[in-house]
């Protein structure tokens, strides 16, 4: 079946970073509107965008209830125009999304270096623990709260005067590295979930260099 003069949605795509999750689709509506529903494999369908002309729908509120569940969405198409002229239009067209498991698939957002502190020939580099929209007991969890030891950070660091990079890894949000006394270093970090098969790495953080405001230096 289906509805006269409507086009089924297509290219249903999940866009998700740090669990902020949007479903996008095509086409831009011409004389039609959409309703989006989301469900877990075992749950009821829940409407999130009802009779909308948008071609995206924010499903974050639903997926953060259990980020380890697998979700499916569907987009229904209806004819637009004057409401009273459409009446009962029969079964609407709909298209299913790909399945989406937030814990395994959400993109890791670009991390930020919160601070670095030099004490002699050691530098402590701290990565900001970004807040997500996942809640527990009415508080928002951080990325580390959600992923625990599944999440590691890779630090890239190099002398300001050269291009040779060194790396360090941590399963906390802090690095303690050895540096040469009297040398300035630059740092960049990347979030990684080694156990994943897709979306394993974030983009690199902005570079921060010693001798700039973020750092704190104590010569001992």
């Amino acid at each position: 079946s289906g509805t006269t003069n409507t086009v089924a949605a297509y290219n249903l795509t999940w866009k998700s970073t740090n669990f902020k999750t949007i479903l996008e689709w095509e086409p831009k509506p011409v004389n039609q509107v959409y309703t989006v529903q989301i469900s877990t494999k075992s749950g009821d369908w829940k409407s999130k965008c009802f009779y909308t002309t948008d071609t995206e729908c924010d499903l974050t509120d639903e997926i953060v209830k259990d980020v380890k569940q697998t979700y499916l969405a569907r987009v229904f198409s209806y004819p637009a125009g004057n409401v009273e002229s459409t009446g009962s239009a029969g079964e609407p067209l709909y298209e299913n999304s790909p399945e989406f498991t937030p814990y395994l698939e959400t993109n890791l957002g670009q991390p930020t270096i919160q601070s670095f502190e030099q004490v002699g020939t050691k530098v402590n580099v701290t990565v900001e623990d970004e807040r997500t929209l996942v809640r527990r007991n009415n508080t928002f969890l951080s990325l580390r709260d959600v992923f625990g030891k599944d999440l590691i950070y890779t630090l890239y660091y190099w002398k300001s005067s050269s291009s040779g990079k060194k790396t360090a890894k941590t399963n906390t949000n802090e690095f303690l590295i050895d540096v040469d006394k009297g040398e300035n270093y630059c740092f960049s970090v990347q979030a990684v979930i080694p156990s994943r098969t897709v979306n394993r790495k974030s983009t690199d953080s902005p570079v921060e260099c010693m001798g700039q405001e973020k750092g704190e230096f104590r010569e001992i």
């Epitope: 309703t35 529903q37 009821d44 369908w45 829940k46 409407s47 409401v83 009962s88 079964e91």
Partner: nanobody, 121 residues
């Protein structure tokens, strides 16, 4: 005669409140999901709120969340939309519609004739 009839619309100042009613005659509402849909002049219709037939689960569009409340009284065969803190952009014809669905109707077996809501100072 089988129909849905909306009432409770009218002219209200910004910040004011209205309570819309959607009453069914000729059939019982309690087995249907009910949706409120509005259509502003020159715009496409927009889903505002829904309520399920079973567990009372509700849906609100982002533009009305926290301001509008939907509930149903099956004994009176009526669904209500309480609209608070109204804004000029809420001005539209409001329709109720009934159909099967877990919270919002997925097809529309019955439509009301619509009621005008105007928010203006």
């Amino acid at each position: 005669q089988v129909q849905l009839v909306e009432s409770g619309g009218g002219l209200v100042q910004p910040g004011g409140s209205l309570r819309l009613s959607c009453a069914a005659s000729g059939f019982t509402l309690d087995t249907y999901a009910i949706g409120w849909i509005r259509q502003a002049p020159g715009k496409e219709r927009e889903g505002v709120s829904c309520i399920s037939s079973t567990d009372g689960s509700t849906y609100y569009a982002a533009s009305v969340k926290g301001r509008f409340t939907i509930n149903r009284d099956n004994a009176k065969n009526t669904v209500y939309l309480q609209m608070n803190s109204l804004k000029p952009e809420d001005t539209a014809v409001y329709y109720c519609a009934a159909g099967p669905g877990t919270d919002c109707p997925l097809r529309f077996d019955y439509w009301g004739q619509g009621i005008q809501v105007t928010v203006s100072s």
